[in-house]
């Protein structure tokens, strides 16, 4: 039986894939697949803000080597930062931290 | 309802906590918690590398800022690592993939 | 409005350094987009230089790339560009532009560009 | 890198008239085509973006069309401030490239 963080990983890798084998190259996420994978897969994070400039500058900002796409190693990074701001929000309510040291 | 990505990202969060709880900065994973939490959290991605040199050397690639401590930051680039290797054999074996475009 | 502003030498010599600087206004310099530089020969086409953006992401012309530096200052509100060992073929106008976050990231807003004369 | 052929290179019109330029990438570019405006001495102004998308305050006298390796602008009728050079330009992917230029010229 896996671990929950090997879960986490495994669920990480296959929700990429769900999105990006739907339109173009397989093995990215274009516009279109990107938006509908945070809509559906991320909606606290995404919030009310489905305008398309939000989503445009968001596909910009992933979007390190320019192609119009969001390959997996960008997806990564995305995942990472929404993981550090989940952090922030954790670590500043130390009641619900693990034990003090 | 939390979608399973979202619950796999509280998982990076909380695990990361589970252990950097322990000793020292409660922010930041000291050694023996790294080496606690890849055996228990990540056994698959270990297997059976549980030699102190392996340790160390894993150690010294995640701490990047160089200061004996892995912080959330340096975690979330070491899982996207792990989720990247996991990617690479994803992507290696076409009948597992979602359906062609 | 957004407006751009090249400056630096108008005459650089052979085998030295040209140093460019962009002065953005109207605009803060945000993560939103990229600043690029992109150069036009004499009486010829026009060459993408390289760009930087996104939490000082930079890409640059494998052409040109070991030759390339590119950096920026977002406190003046300004990205900056240095060539080294420059010879007579790096004489162009320099313009650096603003790239869009829209589809295809188009080159929305330009400055007016400076000539620069590789020249002994 | 994705070589970009413009064509003509020059063409001479008058005020008033339909004006057709291509473009032909190397390779598909999936509709990232954007086109430009350069008047003597000065930058190049963006008129349209992703093929077809007129840019802010462009006129719609100016369209673009096409798919795959193969684009086109269109001025549907041809004014005084239009005669200037215009290049094509891929935003597919990295490093950026340009097409050689179509100037228009007054007959």
């Known amino acids: 039986m896996a671990c929950p963080l090997e879960k986490a990983l495994d669920v990480m890798v296959s929700t990429f894939h769900k999105y990006s084998g739907k339109e173009g190259d397989k093995f990215k996420l274009n516009k279109s697949e990107l938006k509908e994978l945070l809509t559906r897969e991320l909606p606290s994070f995404l919030g009310k803000r489905t305008d398309e400039a939000a989503f445009q500058k968001l596909m910009s900002n992933l979007d390190s080597n320019r192609d119009n796409e969001v390959d997996f190693q960008e997806y990564c990074v995305f995942l990472s930062c929404i993981a550090m701001m989940c952090n922030e929000f954790f670590e500043g309510f130390p009641d619900k931290q693990p034990r003090k040291k | 309802m939390a979608c399973p990505l979202e619950k796999a990202l509280d998982v990076m969060v909380s695990t990361f906590h589970k252990y950097s709880g322990k000793e020292g900065d409660k922010f930041k994973l000291n050694k023996s918690e790294l080496k606690e939490l890849l055996t228990r959290e990540l056994p698959s991605f270990l297997g059976k590398r549980t030699d102190e040199a392996a340790f160390q050397k894993l150690m010294s690639n995640l701490d990047s800022n160089r200061d004996n401590e892995v912080d959330f930051q340096e975690y979330c680039v070491f899982l996207s690592c792990i989720a990247m290797m996991c990617n690479e054999f994803f992507e290696g074996f076409p009948d597992k993939q979602p359906r062609k475009k | 409005q957004v407006q751009l502003q090249e400056s630096g030498p108008g005459l650089v010599k052979p085998s030295q350094t040209l140093s460019l600087t962009c002065t953005v206004s109207?605009?803060?310099?945000?993560?939103?987009?990229?600043w690029n530089w992109i150069r036009q020969h004499p009486g010829s086409g026009l060459e993408w230089i390289g760009h930087i953006g996104y939490g000082g992401n930079i890409n640059y012309n494998p052409s040109l790339k070991n030759r390339l530096s590119m950096s920026r200052d977002t406190s003046k509100n300004q990205f900056s560009l240095k060539l080294s060992s420059v010879t007579a073929a790096d004489t162009a106008v320099y313009y650096c532009t603003r790239e869009s976050f829209y589809d295809g990231y188009p080159f929305d807003y330009w400055g007016q560009g400076t000539l620069v004369t590789v020249s002994s | 890198d994705i070589q970009m052929t413009q064509s003509p290179s020059s063409l001479s019109a008058s005020v008033g008239d339909r004006v057709t330029i291509t473009c032909r990438a190397s390779q598909d570019i999936r509709n990232y085509l954007n086109w430009y405006q350069q008047k003597p001495g000065k930058a190049l102004k963006l008129l349209l973006y992703y093929t077809s998308r007129l840019h802010s305050g462009v006129p719609s006298r100016f369209s673009g069309s096409g798919s795959g390796t193969d684009y086109t602008l269109t001025i549907s009728s041809l004014q005084p401030e239009d005669f200037a050079t215009y290049y094509c330009?891929?935003?597919?992917?990295?490093?950026?490239?340009f097409g050689g230029g179509t100037k228009v010229e007054i007959k």
């Open positions: 330009q891929q935003g597919n992917s990295l490093p950026r490239t």
């Open positions: 109207g605009d803060s310099f945000t993560n939103d987009y990229y």
